[in-house]
Interface confidence: medium
């Protein structure tokens, strides 16, 4: 008799998920000598242990603690770049500015970037058919809890000036419901972090508005100020030029506003 399987609203586990995590881990430890000590088989076992045989709507941060322990990594706390709804540009930036780090530059972020996963209660199977959607099904699903956990830890580690890249093309430039707005903002440590500097990335070539005056940015400023952290904001009018100038700062065109 075929067993009834829960149908969730979200896409299922990414194909060949175990092989992908293991292969990414091996590559990461090859690229980053400081992580060469990591045993990738143990990392995969800990990752698997966080969600296999568990109800995919009942995952807790505690479930991920063994993985967090194995993936412990020290990044320069004053070189952290957070982002919201503009991942690709943030990654392009840290590729050029090699001394700055997004969450996806860390082992755990790199392992999980763009992947989906979930299991089933009381079976050791990975569910490749469907996984819970955060809105339609439940928020305590394996993927959401993972990102909440690693994002919280990443924000807690930050110090001095923390940068965040925000998408100026969206109706809510700062969104309280994003991972940045709901997790990272509230886990910056005022005793360590002096300033949060927002970079608002403009989408249109002719867009010369000061998006730092946007009501949602003012809301972010208010939240940050109440946490005794200073706030500053910059418009990045030309993201393409911005990246080129990070790459070639001595270029004569890079003295003007970007």
């Amino acid at each position: 008799v075929p067993r009834w399987r829960q149908q969730w609203s979200g896409p299922g586990t990414t194909k060949r998920f175990p092989e992908t995590v293991l292969a990414r881990c091996v590559k990461y430890t090859e690229i980053h000598p400081e992580m060469r000590h990591v045993d990738c088989q143990s990392v995969w076992d800990a990752f698997k242990g966080a969600f296999i045989s568990k109800h995919p709507c009942n995952i807790t941060e505690e479930d991920y603690q063994p993985l967090m322990k194995l993936g412990t990594q020290t990044v320069p706390c004053n070189k952290i770049l957070l982002w919201s709804r503009i991942k690709d540009l943030a990654h392009q930036f840290t590729q050029v500015q090699r001394d700055m780090f997004t969450l996806e530059d860390t082992l755990l972020g790199y392992l999980a970037d763009d992947l989906t996963w979930c299991g089933e209660f009381n079976t050791s199977k990975i569910n490749y058919q469907s996984c819970p959607d955060w809105r339609k099904d439940c928020s305590n699903n394996p993927v959401s809890v993972f990102w909440k956990t690693v994002s919280r830890r990443f924000a807690e580690a930050a110090c001095d000036v923390v940068h965040v890249m925000l998408n100026g093309s969206r109706s809510k430039i700062f969104d309280k419901n994003s991972t940045f707005g709901s997790v990272e903002v509230h886990n910056l440590q005022p005793e360590k972090v002096q300033t949060l500097e927002a970079w608002v990335i403009h989408g249109g070539r002719e867009d010369s508005r000061d998006l730092c005056q946007d009501p949602t940015i003012k809301e972010l400023e208010s939240i940050i100020s109440k946490r005794n952290i200073q706030f500053s904001c910059k418009n990045i009018y030309r993201p393409d030029k911005f990246l080129q100038c990070v790459k070639n700062p001595e270029d004569s065109s890079c003295t003007s506003e970007i």
Epitope: A23, E30, I31, E104, Y110, Q244
Partner: nanobody
Framework: QVQLVESGGGEVQPGGSLRLSCTAS????????IGWFRRAPGKEREGIAC??????HTNYGDSVMGRFTISRDDRAVYLQMNNLEAGDTAIYYC???????????????????WGQGTQVTVSS
């Protein structure tokens, strides 16, 4: 000096096939997700295919889906192009992404340096 070398281009009739290769000097190609891009005369550079570091996951632009196949081994990344059309005429480039995944095919301005590319001409 980080350098990428694209090869395998040429002139081919509509419906024909070519296999492009991308090799690297100065860095480990197998540490990166790799994208193939192209620039047709008078057009913007376009992302057409990407393969992640594991070789498991691939992503294609709408214009080449079902006709082009990206693959990799330890030495190179390949783009097998079948059923070529006049609209595929362009200079083809490969480029590394820093990240393990390739969810997007947008042109990454941050790629360290573009190679010379390899010319593909589809003409009867």
């Amino acid at each position: 000096q980080v350098q990428l070398v694209e090869s395998g281009g040429g002139e081919v009739q509509p419906g024909g096939s070519l296999r492009l290769s991308c090799t690297a000097s100065g860095f480990r190609l197998d540490y990166y997700a790799i994208g193939w891009f192209r620039r047709a005369p008078g057009k913007e550079r376009e992302g057409i295919a990407c393969i992640d570091i594991t070789g498991i996951h691939t992503n294609y632009g709408d214009s080449v889906m079902g006709r082009f196949t990206i693959s990799r081994d330890d030495r190179a990344v390949y783009l097998q192009m079948n059923n070529l059309e006049a609209g595929d005429t362009a200079i083809y480039y490969c480029a590394p992404a820093r990240f393990s995944a390739c969810s997007a095919l947008d042109v990454k301005l941050s790629f360290t340096s573009w190679g010379q590319g390899t010319q593909v001409t589809v003409s009867s």
